[in-house]
């Protein structure tokens, strides 16, 4: 049940996550302009990854697209890479882990198979929700090394007698919106890593093997089990380790080839 | 045809308070944002405030902050100026106009003359 | 507060000919987002409200007649006439549109010489 819990709020989270990064990628909000030095501009200026916009008191709001491809800064060429490719892994993640979930079956699929596909969704999520943040980031080291620079522009270019308005932008709520969207992808993988170790059947953790003595039976169960006389006596005994916490009929609908001999 | 017809012509004394209305039509009063600008006799123009008739937010000239005060009355799309402590250079042409594109006044109401005399 | 300067004061100007008004902002006006200067000519005849000409500099306004026209750029800025015509009598005013408090110049009044 805690497994199956686990990997349920692990896909949950992920595709919240998945859906705020593919949400902060689309926001033209990634950068605003910063009004500490010019509260009273009538005039707003924002950017996101892939167009410019002003926003006009009067209401009036305009946005450009960044139609060329070669004339934009490397970094943000950078940043758009880093998100696009955490939306492909992120997609690509959700539709794997969507067959693994536990709660829907598939034909006569092995809970190995789903172990292995909840593991590589984890794992893809986790990288997917490490581009997003690294993006993110990346995009917020670019705005203040530039807001530095531009503050020192804007005091050194003070001799004339007449003044320009020198704009500075800031963190957009997109960059927001990417770190936590980041962070949810990342600990719905997280999620998804644990689940599998819960779903795996662990090779090494035999069930009660019974080699039939001359004169009685005495059930084996070696690696960390104690023997117990009885055939099958003890069958519903809890593991003393084990990835998830289950009972041990919880697993018999997928006999393994050690149940018995 | 976007119209915005202002009140008539209004005395006052020194210390009153006047309130001008100018009401729209022609298109959604909730759309675009009205300012108000004042012009004394035989001088320039002199932006007074912005107020957007979908949530009444304004935004004022600091030379008018404490004495203007801009309200709206969605149901019957009119705008309302209202002066108080009114001395004698508040004698003006008061104009209601709407906020474009560019930050610009594309139609004016044809002014109201508030005139501040002993 | 930006301060709008217009020159000159007052313009004659013959009738076909070219009038030509200047605007100087102490202050830029071009915003670095979209490379446009927010700036703004109105014209007013006598007893009239302004009626708008030009914004963002060089736009003309629909049903603004083309010999109206409007340049430059940061803190400079002009408002050609390029024929005068009789109903072109009138005061014009520019007007600083990217700063609260919005200012107008001064004006500058045109006449037929």
């Known amino acids: 049940m805690a497994v199956t819990a686990c990997q349920g709020l692990g896909f949950v989270v992920s595709l919240i996550g998945i859906a705020g990064i593919i949400a902060a990628t689309c926001m033209d909000q990634w950068s605003t302009q910063d009004l500490y030095n010019n509260p009273v501009t009538a005039v707003f200026n924002y950017q996101g990854l892939w167009r410019s916009c002003v926003r006009e008191s009067s209401g009036f709001t305009e946005c450009r697209g960044y139609f060329t491809l070669l004339g934009l800064p490397a970094m943000l060429q950078a940043v758009r890479a880093l998100m696009i490719v955490g939306i492909v892994l992120g997609a690509i993640g959700l539709l794997v882990s969507i067959f693994a979930l536990k709660c829907i079956r598939i034909g006569s699929m092995e809970d190995s198979a789903k172990a292995n596909m909840t593991l590589t969704s984890g794992i893809m999520f986790i990288v997917s929700g490490l581009c997003a943040i690294a993006g993110v980031s990346v995009f917020a080291n670019m705005l203040v090394t530039n807001f530095w620079m531009s503050t020192a522009n804007m005091y050194t270019g003070m001799g004339g007698m007449v003044q320009t308005v020198q704009t500075r932008y800031t963190f957009g709520a997109a960059l927001f919106v990417g770190w936590v969207a980041g962070g949810l992808t990342l600990i719905g993988g997280v999620m998804m890593c644990i689940a599998c170790r819960g779903l795996a059947p662990e090779e090494t953790n035999y069930k009660a093997v019974s080699y039939h003595a001359s004169g009685h039976s005495v059930a084996y169960k070696p690696g960390g089990f104690k023997a117990s006389t009885g055939f099958g006596s003890n069958t519903k005994n809890k593991k003393i380790y084990d990835g998830g916490a289950r009972t041990e009929d919880e697993v018999q609908s997928y006999p393994s080839k050690h149940d018995y001999v | 045809e976007v119209q915005l017809v202002q009140s008539g012509a209004e005395v006052k004394k020194p210390g009153a308070s006047v309130k001008v209305s100018c009401k729209a039509s022609g298109y959604t009063f909730t759309s675009s944002w009205l300012i108000w600008v004042r012009q004394a006799p035989g001088q320039g123009l002199e932006w007074i405030g912005t107020i957007v008739p979908s949530d009444s937010y304004t935004n004022y000239n600091q030379k008018f902050k404490d004495r203007a005060t801009l309200t709206v009355d969605k149901s019957t799309s009119t705008a309302y100026m209202e002066l108080s402590s009114l001395r004698s250079e508040d004698t003006a042409v008061y104009y209601c106009?709407?906020?474009?594109?560019?930050?610009?006044?594309?139609?004016w109401g044809q002014g109201t003359l508030v005139t501040v005399s002993s | 507060d930006i301060v709008m300067t217009q020159s000159p004061d007052s313009l004659s100007v013959g009738l076909g000919e070219r009038a030509t008004i200047n605007c100087k902002s102490s202050q830029s006006v071009l915003n670095s987002g979209n490379q446009k200067n927010y700036l703004t000519w109105y014209q007013q005849k006598p007893g009239q409200p302004p009626k708008l000409l030009i914004y963002?500099?060089?736009a003309r306004q629909s049903g603004v007649p083309d010999r109206f026209s409007g340049s430059g750029s940061g803190t400079d800025f002009t408002l050609t006439i390029s024929s005068l015509q009789a109903e072109d009598v009138a005061v014009y005013y520019c007007?600083?549109?990217?700063?609260?408090?919005?200012?107008f110049g001064q004006g500058t009044k045109v006449e037929i010489k």
């Open positions: 106009t709407r906020f474009r594109t560019g930050n610009s006044f594309d139609y």
């Open positions: 007007q600083n549109s990217i700063a609260y408090p919005f200012t």
């Open positions: 963002w500099a060089v």
